[in-house]
């Protein structure tokens, strides 16, 4: 190989090993004879070398830096080569170092031609291996701008005062050319400023200076998104640091197209704007730190660009200034994630503060759209708290939970609503009474309606749920021991229209002792499926919990348990299963942890089942599945 | 009123059997545990063998597994205990006791024996 | 299986004395314990179950307490009927078992 440097060229060459690997042989540069690991040609210098091994590759590496001085002279702009050129070269990894000096008064632009830059953060790397390296100068200080790819926004970055620009190729790289030019432009004004250019939906993802170290104190980058113009906008910020300031605060500003507000100023943990149409700056301003803890500023933000949809033209009102104790969350639903790009879905406050997920409060109006692709990965999520703090005021009190018409003109599906229903402990109790029968939810008989309700107990400490519930059933009220919560789940768009099957009334009861009873009117028609709360999981320890069971005059109901034995084991107490006859008050006892279940036994009267657990083995717990026919009384069986 | 009465005790020889029976009323059989408890002459109680209400489960003291089982006949209102190779040391009194089931500080239990016949001896000699 | 060892196993007491008889067993039972009382050539009588509740018709002078190992019956002021054997069971599954008897007898 020769090299050789013109005198006036400013370029030295360096060549040395790399990253030490665990190669048996070593290998050395060849000069004239001499073995040797290292070789510096400075300007003026002709230097002929081999190598002695047959892949130098995997051993050296070679740094051509060019010094440009624009401070006594004038500047050499435009388009920047790779010189020596590349086919001179050995081919060895390869880093160009430009080092440009400049006056501070003076502006240098560099100008990335397409396929554009694309800013990587700790821990990544380029596809190809081929990356920059871009670094700024506060003084005597390198500020490090970034690293980058190819293949992304970045079209520009200004600086003053100088630029460091590094380049490197890996050794099977063909690429000869730098792929920038430089430009002189005014005093910017600040630490640099960036320009990403989108040409179409996708998302950026941008770091402040030296990150993820600090930011240098009390300086100002800007970067500045040239957007199409159908196209939105949104920022989110993926990772930020505040420092310890002592004069100034740290924020964001942005210059909006069409704000009367321009800048807007955004503190760092504020929702950053969404839903931006056209080209618009965002800028980092630091602050006096506090010298003795001064702490760190970093930032890493993420650009979104898309299309918008309808909807994001049209504002929706969400009046909860009568609700009490509520608030609605619009979310997206949990989906498996792609690793094509997915346009952002966001839901807006008042059109600007844009974010993947928003929640409402009561006691106010909300305005809000939608920034989103497809309004079906959104969902909603409402809860609200109808609580009794003095028993004496609520006693025989009536709630309607139904869920208030505004929710449906929201263009977002209804997931969960829950209310969250609360009574002072152990002086009141609650009853559920469904507009319409319900049904449980079994294996046996699964509910195939729209919507369910699910029953479960809102004590912290309780694991108890007690069950999914369903109109068009037989379950004619619900009542419970203490603080539920009800959860209206919907299962499809079809919720909709039938809503008005929705519709349970909450009352405040005397306060009673099991857990929860099942007022039960079995239809005549078929079998009613009843299972113990907490099914698979076991009745909780100590439980109890009691059926009600209506049977008409006209009619025999025939009880029927799923198994033969229930499987329980008793660490403490034991499990009772209690059939009652309401008329006679005659009772059956049967220890569920010992006995056989009976066998299907036919009533003519209304009757009670209880069951009373014990504190279960840990994997041997009770679950009880039985169910209910009801067939015509004839004359020999009275 | 509720009550119990045991029969089929008397005077049986070593290795020999006997079969006690306990006829229950003024109540419902079905829904409580019954036990079998002795008494040696002039010592204390012993408790030999229980059974649940729908018989489903059984139990036994030590000194008599094996040898005793203890069954019940619902529909008769009838508790049972076959004794088989009989011991002198089996010489006793045997009541038939029934089991109350209570709630105590919410946990559902057997709480002890409330309702006893009066016993019938059981002499194992030859 | 659970040992229960009742104290005394005599006692000596007057008409109107606080007695106090004492039942330990071998192993924790937590509150599963009974007191019965039998008269000779009588049936037990169950007189407390769960270590302290009183059986229906059982006078009030009798009481129970104790948790885990350490159990105790007390007859506040004695009776002429209240002369007779008192024994312990544990009710902590099965196999039951009783202490060996207290017999209380007239001073």
């Known amino acids: 190989f020769e090299i050789a440097l013109p005198r006036e060229s400013n370029i030295t060459v360096l060549i040395k090993l790399g990253t030490p690997t665990l190669l048996a042989k070593p290998c050395y540069i060849v000069i004239s004879k001499r073995h040797t690991t290292m070789l510096s040609i400075k300007p003026g210098e002709r230097i002929l070398f081999t190598f002695s091994c047959q892949s130098p590759e995997n051993h050296f590496v070679i740094e051509i830096q060019k010094n440009i001085d624009c401070m006594s002279g004038p500047c050499p702009f435009g388009e920047v080569q790779l010189q020596p050129s590349t086919s001179l070269l050995p081919t060895l990894n390869r880093t160009f170092i430009w080092d440009v000096k400049a006056h501070k008064s003076i502006g240098l632009e560099l100008q990335f031609s397409i396929p554009r830059l694309r800013q990587f953060g700790p821990g990544e790397s380029c596809p190809d291996g081929v990356t920059y390296s871009i670094s700024g100068r506060i003084d005597a200080t390198v500020v490090r701008i970034g690293t980058f790819c190819s293949n992304g926004t970045v079209s520009r970055i200004k600086m003053q005062e100088g630029v460091k620009m590094a380049l490197h190729l890996p050794w099977f790289h063909p690429r000869n050319v730098s792929g920038f030019s430089i430009a002189n432009r005014s005093s910017i004004k600040r630490l640099c400023i960036i320009e990403s250019v989108f040409e179409g939906e996708g998302s950026a993802t941008l770091m402040s200076a030296n990150y993820p170290e600090g930011f240098p104190e009390d300086e100002l980058m800007t970067w500045q998104f040239v957007i199409p113009a159908h196209l939105r906008a949104s920022v989110s910020f993926l990772n930020f640091n505040l420092s310890n300031c002592e004069r100034k605060e740290e924020r964001v500003e942005y210059y909006i197209p069409g704000s009367t507000t321009n800048p807007e100023v955004f503190k760092l943990e504020d929702k950053q704007p969404g839903n931006m149409a056209g080209n618009f700056n965002l800028s980092l301003q630091g602050c006096d730190q506090d010298a003795q803890n001064p702490g760190i500023l970093r930032l890493q933000f993420q650009v979104l660009v898309q299309h918008p949809q309808n909807e994001s033209n049209k504002i929706y009102v969400v009046d909860l200034s009568n609700e009490r104790a509520t608030s609605l969350t619009i979310e997206p639903r949990p989906v498996k994630q792609s690793r094509k790009f997915v346009p952002g879905c966001f839901v807006c406050l008042e059109s600007r503060t844009c974010s993947t997920n928003l929640t409402l409060t009561s006691g106010s109006k909300h305005k809000i759209s939608f920034l989103c692709d497809n309004l079906t990965r959104l969902w909603m999520n409402v809860e609200k708290n109808i609580s009794c703090t003095d028993h004496r005021y609520c006693q025989r009190k009536s709630y309607s939970l139904q869920v208030p018409s505004d929710i449906f003109h929201l263009p977002v599906e209804l997931h969960d609503f829950s209310w969250k229903l609360l009574v002072p402990k152990d002086r009141l109790s609650l009853v559920l009474v469904p507009a319409q029968k319900l049904q449980q939810h079994t294996h046996e008989k699964p509910c195939n309606t729209s919507f369910s309700y699910l029953v479960a107990s809102a004590i912290p400490s309780q694991d108890l749920y007690f069950g999914s519930f369903c109109p068009g059933g037989s379950i004619e009220q619900i009542q419970v021991k203490q603080n539920i919560s009800v959860t209206l789940r919907t299962f499809a768009p079809s919720f909709r229209q039938e809503a008005s099957r929705q519709g349970l009334t909450v009352s405040f009861i005397p306060y009673f002792k099991e857990e929860g009873v099942f007022t039960v009117t079995p239809d005549t028609k078929s079998k009613v499926y009843l299972r113990t709360p907490n099914w698979d999981r076991g009745l909780p320890s100590l439980t109890s919990v009691s059926w009600n069971i209506s049977v008409p005059r006209d009619q025999v109901a025939c009880l029927t348990f799923f198994k033969e034995r229930t499987g329980v084991v008793c660490q403490t107490g034991r499990a009772f299963m209690i059939i009652q006859e309401q008329r006679t008050r005659a009772e059956e006892i049967f220890s569920l942890d010992e006995d056989a279940l009976p066998k299907p036994r036919f009533h003519h009267h209304s009757f009670w089942v209880n069951i009373s657990n014990c504190s279960p083995a840990s994997g041997k717990q009770l679950d009880l599945l039985f169910w209910v026919t009801l067939t015509p009384r004839t004359v020999d069986l009275t | 009123e509720v009550q119990l009465l045991e029969s089929g005790g008397g005077l049986v020889q070593p290795g020999g059997s006997l079969r006690l029976s306990c006829a229950a009323s003024?109540?419902?059989?079905?829904?409580?545990?019954m036990n079998w408890v002795r008494q040696a002459p002039g010592k204390g109680l012993e408790w030999v063998s229980a059974i649940s209400g729908g018989g489903g489960s059984t139990y036994y003291a030590d000194s008599v597994k094996g040898r005793f089982t203890i069954s019940r006949d619902n529909s008769k209102n009838t508790l049972y205990l076959q004794m088989n190779s009989l011991r002198a040391e089996d010489t006793a009194v045997y009541y038939c006791?029934?089991?109350?089931?209570?709630?105590?500080?919410?946990?559902?239990?057997?709480?002890?024996?409330?309702?006893w016949g009066q016993g019938t001896t059981v002499t194992v000699s030859s | 299986d659970i040992q229960l060892t009742q104290s005394p196993s005599f006692l000596s007491a007057s008409v109107g004395d606080r007695v106090t008889i004492t039942c330990r067993a071998s192993q924790g039972i937590s509150s599963y314990l009974a007191w019965y009382q039998q008269k000779p050539g009588k049936a037990p009588k169950l007189l407390i179950y769960?270590?302290?509740t009183l059986q229906g018709g059982v006078p009030s002078r009798f009481s129970g307490s104790g948790s885990g190992t350490e159990f105790t019956l007390t007859i506040s002021s004695l009776q002429p009927e209240d002369f007779a054997t008192y024994y312990c069971?544990?009710?902590?599954?099965?196999?039951?078992?009783f202490g060996q008897g207290t017999k209380v007898e007239i001073k």
């Open positions: 006791a029934k089991e109350s089931i209570t709630m105590v500080r919410g946990v559902m239990d057997y709480y002890g024996m409330d309702v």
């Open positions: 769960a270590a302290s």
């Open positions: 069971q544990h009710l902590n599954r099965f196999p039951r078992t």
């Open positions: 003024g109540f419902t059989f079905s829904n409580y545990a």
